[in-house]
């Protein structure tokens, strides 16, 4: 499975969205879980609701929230108030009794608020756009793993 | 009409390869696991594994791991199970079966193949 | 793997008695995907009750099936002639999917 990287910006949500074929998967709860190593035990974080019918229900654990549209076959997670040690590599999981099928890989890497930095230097912002509530969680980039960038300095 | 169609009786010797069908009609063939069971004479009912036409992932049951493969052609909606190389122990009937899905989940398995007979005698 | 111990092994009663069939599992069956399937000689199994307790299509309502985790019931409350049979359980929640060694429902 290639791993989707996803980054976010500290303090604020991020939304990782996990499509599967809905019938391959139908009647399965759906896990999100955070890898511990490399070759580690995946430990789960949130599960979706345990009445499978009831699954577009939100269902929370800390400020991990999740979602599955059965229908459009899409789990939604969304870490609120992102923090750097939320950072890591993370599972969508299809849950079949004991066994967990990996459905998708996520590097979660979280950006640091330029706002916050304390070496910005005289940032100017205008008094109207000073918040950053409601910010487009889309506007986080997502690539494959497996493609080359150039690095950053 | 849902329906699962399996080849008809085999008689086979000890060592001899086999491979068996299931043919699904009346529904979208790779929207759904396919499942094989086992039946030795006078027994009960053997689990042997599973497969998902759509892209052909397939789970076995410990005891046929590696006795058996499960296969599917999408073309022809044809599940199979076949096998390189025939035991005395592997005369049984052997029916597929389809996963049902229900509004509230997973619905069990409904219907099932009418049965194939192989018999494996030297 | 999951075991299904399903008892008695074999129940003799007569037409329009109630028959008690009970299946329990080594572990705990989640979201309850157990069901109830009848085999009569020289046929393939037939699915009676999936999800513990919702009767498939075309099922009599003397059928029923109740219980959760590990401890499932199937229940015919007036045996018909054409009800004896063999009755087995499969849990289709963890692979493999295992069944239970049956239950044969003879007339006594």
């Known amino acids: 499975l290639n791993t989707t990287v996803l980054q976010g910006m500290a303090g604020q949500s991020l939304r990782v969205s996990c499509t599967y074929d809905a019938l391959k998967h139908w009647g399965r709860r759906k896990a999100w879980c955070r890898q511990l190593g490399e070759e580690g035990p995946c430990q789960r974080v949130v599960s979706t609701h345990g009445v499978w019918l009831l699954a577009f229900l939100k269902k929370r654990n800390g400020s991990t929230v999740i979602a599955d549209d059965t229908l459009a076959g899409t789990v939604t997670i969304t870490l609120k108030n992102l923090q750097a040690g939320d950072a890591g590599l993370y599972q969508c999981q299809s849950l079949r009794g004991r066994e967990a099928e990996v459905l998708q890989k996520v590097l979660v890497e979280v950006l640091e608020d330029p706002l916050d930095d304390q070496d910005a230097g005289d940032l100017w912002v205008p008094e109207e756009s000073s918040s950053f509530e409601g910010a487009q969680v889309e506007h986080s980039t997502s690539r494959n793993q497996e493609t080359s960038f150039p690095p950053t300095s | 009409e849902v329906q699962l169609v399996q080849s008809g009786a085999e008689v086979k010797k000890p060592g001899e390869s086999l491979k068996i069908s299931c043919k699904g009609s009346?529904?979208?063939?790779?929207?759904?696991?396919i499942g094989w069971v086992r039946q030795m004479p006078g027994k009960g009912l053997e689990w042997m594994g599973i497969?998902?036409?759509?892209?052909?992932?397939?789970r076995y049951s410990p005891s046929f791991q590696g006795q058996v493969t499960i296969s599917v052609d999408k073309s022809s909606s044809t599940a199979y199970l076949q096998w390189s190389s025939l035991k005395a122990s592997d005369t049984a009937i052997y029916y597929c079966?389809?996963?049902?899905?229900?509004?509230?989940?997973?619905?069990?398995?409904?219907?099932w193949g009418q049965g194939t007979l192989v018999t494996v005698s030297s | 793997e999951i075991v299904l111990t399903q008892s008695p092994g074999t129940l003799s009663l007569s037409p329009g008695e109630r028959a008690t069939l009970s299946c329990r599992a080594s572990q705990s069956v989640s979201s309850s995907y157990l069901a109830w399937y009848q085999q009569k000689p020289g046929q393939a199994p037939r699915l009676l009750i999936y999800g513990a307790s919702s009767r498939a299509t075309g099922i009599p309502d003397r059928f029923s099936g109740s219980g959760s985790g590990t401890d499932f019931t199937l229940t015919i409350s007036r045996l018909e002639p054409e009800d004896f049979a063999l009755y087995y359980c499969?849990?289709?929640?963890?692979?493999?999917?295992?069944f239970g060694p049956g239950t044969k429902v003879d007339i006594k």
């Open positions: 497969i998902y036409p759509g892209d052909s992932d397939t």
């Open positions: 499969q849990q289709y929640d963890t692979s493999p999917f295992t």
């Open positions: 079966t389809r996963q049902a899905i229900a509004v509230t989940g997973l619905g069990g398995f409904d219907p």
């Open positions: 009346g529904y979208t063939f790779t929207s759904y696991w």
